[in-house]
Every structure is written in structure tokens, then in C-alpha cells.
Amino acid sequence: EVEKTACPSGKKAREIDESLIFYKKWELEACVDAALLATQMDRVNAIPFTYEQLDVLKHKLDELYPQGYPESVIQHLGYLFLKMSPEDIRKWNVTSLETLKALLEVNKGHEMSPQVATLIDRFVKGRGQLDKDTLDTLTAFYPGYLCSLSPEELSSVPPSSIWAVRPQDLDTCDPRQLDVLYPKARLAFQNMNGSEYFVKIQSFLGGAPTEDLKALSQQNVSMDLATFMKLRTDAVLPLTVAEVQKLLGPHVEGLKAEERHRPVRDWILRQRQDDLDTLGLGLQGGIPNGYLVLDLSMQEALS
């Protein structure tokens, strides 16, 4: 906190410029008018102040705007954005995508900070939904952004925004999140032809139900093992050996290397050993010949 002292004669700042780096902290406090600072915030971003001097400038803005900064100031905060607390940011009303981009640029290359998370939350809530432009921007800065949202938050993503999603944006998503995103992706890409559709839908398939996997198996898609291993176990279990063979195409040989891992392990346990043998991969653990398989879940449903 800088003591309140009168500004020395001739030192009153008429504009925000480089000469202010020669001001002591108390002189900045006494000689820089907060309203002038607010209107010329863009200039602050071109002046090599020390962190201590920036603290004084932030203090002046805080005094001028106790209820929260206007967007005209927020857009030009630059480094000062990193000095804001989430409580400060919750007072803001940020509506411009340009403002959001400018602030995300300051934090570029760093992990998503509490300030950034709060800013994004305020921005998205203000817009009412995650539109395509916003999603484009956020995933460009933070590829993992989408997977940081809860399934409830993801439900506000319109299908049209799914076009902005890149495969790497989904790397850290869990099955609950993909369950929400997959139907939106299916809707977004529904008018594409077979091979193009598969390329687009592939990274969302961790949320696909059995019937969609069965349908894909009829389309010669040649799903790779990495994608197969991310499928929902409950969606894979009902697939027949023939369907999995068609789904994977030439990649079916990779099942052998994954036979101890889910969902392959659990799927093998559900298949007749005879059928598994037809693949010629030496997969073991299927149901021996002559055994009858009872679907107990069906029996419970009937009783």
C-alpha cells in the first residue's frame, strides 16, 4: 500500500508514457490520474514497468472501479490480468471474444490458471452457450479445455460447435464426457459420406453405443486398435467376432497384443472359443464348445 502524498510540482502525468518508469511508487500513486490511466490502458502494455509499479497502477484501477472494471479497461489489462484474483474477475462482464483472446494471449504457454478458468466461466455464462467461435478460441489456447468441463456443462455445447473440435482436444476426456459429446458429433457430421464421416467421428467413438458400432462394422472403416481400446466396454461386449473383424479390418491382428486389457479381455470372455479361433490369432479365454450362455440380466428383467 502506497502512502497518500501530494504530487510534486510539474510531475502530474498528462498522458501514460515511458517517462512514468522513472516515477517512484508514491509518485505514480500521487501523480497519475486513475481516469486517465483507464482511458489509456493500451499504452501500459507498451511500457516496461516493474511488477511493483504495475501493482500501484492496479491499485488505482481498483479504487476507480470498486464494482468491477469495464470491458474497455479489461481488454487492455495485459499482464495486470495475471494480478487479478478470481474474486476480481467475477465482478466483470466480458462479452467480446476479442477481449477474451487478448487476455488468454497474456497467459499463453502456461497452465490454465484460476484467473483464466474464472474468466472463461464468466464469458461462457454470459453467452449462454459454448458457440463455435468461443470453442475455437478456447481449444486453440487450451487443447484440454473441453475435457475440463462437466457433462452438465458440455450439454450446452451446440452440435454446430463440434466442427471446431480436434482429436487432441478430446485426449483427456473420460467416458461420461464422451457420452455427452458423441450424440452431438453424430448429429453434426450426419450428412458426410462413409469414409469422411468416420474420420470426423472417430475421436468421439468412446461415447458410441453398440448399435452404432455394428453399423460402422458394415462400412469397411478399418478402425485402429487405439480407437477400439477407447470404446465403451458395455458397447463392445455384444459385438460378434465377425462384427469386430469387419470393424477392425486389417487391424484385427492387434487384438492379440491387447487380449489382457479392457475392453478386449472382457469381450473375449463373452465370445465362443470356436468363433475366436476363426480369427487365427490364438486368442484364448472364450466360452468352451458345448457350454450354454445364460443372459442373467435378461432373466432378472423378466422375473
Epitope: I47, P48, G78, V106
Partner: nanobody, 116 residues
């Protein structure tokens, strides 16, 4: 936070000269405006000089005008502070601070200058 690295400090006799350097660690300084600051023992840090990202604009504190010269070599990604006619009152730790695109900031840990 982005780091700057100062070097070139040392012990010098009154009337002598030193050239301080400011370089970036892990990024390039070329589009950064740079300010030189100093802090004497028990005193507040004060501005000494500044130079724009292009090198076209320079500024100096009254106490060093005519004695200190700030310059930059963008090919070497370095900013210099040439200090001539040094006085005992120039004894301090000298720091550089920078501001780049979007108001990104960087600052160094300082290099010590003793005039005695």
C-alpha cells in the same frame, strides 16, 4: 513468469565504465520494450532508462543523462546499458524489465554494480 538475465556488473573505480547486458531466457527479446532499473541498498527501485522494441525511442532518468546509453542488438537478442563516468551514487543492483506483445512481462534477478 518469463525471465530476463542481466550480466556485466562488477567493481569499478569512480569515472570508470561498465556495459551491462540483458538477455532473455527461453524466449526472444526482439519485440520487447526494455527498461533498466536500479536499487541501491535500503532504497526504492528506480528507473534508469528505457528503449522501445525497435530501438527507435530511448529515455533516461535525469540523474544518468549524458553518462548512460541504452541500445539493443536484435541480431544478438540483447539489450545493453553502457555506463560511463560512473559515480559512487551509481552503486546498486541493476535490473532489466520488459514488455512484449499483449502486455506479456519479464524481469531479471539483477546484476550488482559497485563504484568505489
Amino acid at each position: 513468469q518469463l525471465q530476463l538475465v542481466e550480466s556485466g556488473g562488477g567493481l569499478v573505480q569512480p569515472g570508470g565504465s561498465l556495459r551491462l547486458s540483458c538477455a532473455a531466457s527461453g524466449f526472444t527479446l526482439d519485440n520487447y520494450a526494455i527498461g533498466w532499473f536500479r536499487q541501491a541498498p535500503g532504497k526504492e527501485r528506480e528507473g534508469v532508462s528505457s528503449i522501445s522494441s525497435s530501438g527507435g525511442s530511448t529515455n533516461y532518468a535525469d540523474s544518468v543523462k549524458g553518462r548512460f546509453t541504452v541500445s539493443r542488438d536484435n541480431a544478438k537478442h540483447t539489450v545493453y546499458l553502457q555506463m560511463n563516468s560512473l559515480k559512487p551514487e551509481d552503486t546498486a543492483v541493476y535490473y532489466c524489465a520488459g514488455v512484449g506483445d499483449y502486455g506479456r512481462r519479464a524481469m531479471g534477478q539483477g546484476t550488482s554494480v559497485t563504484v568505489s
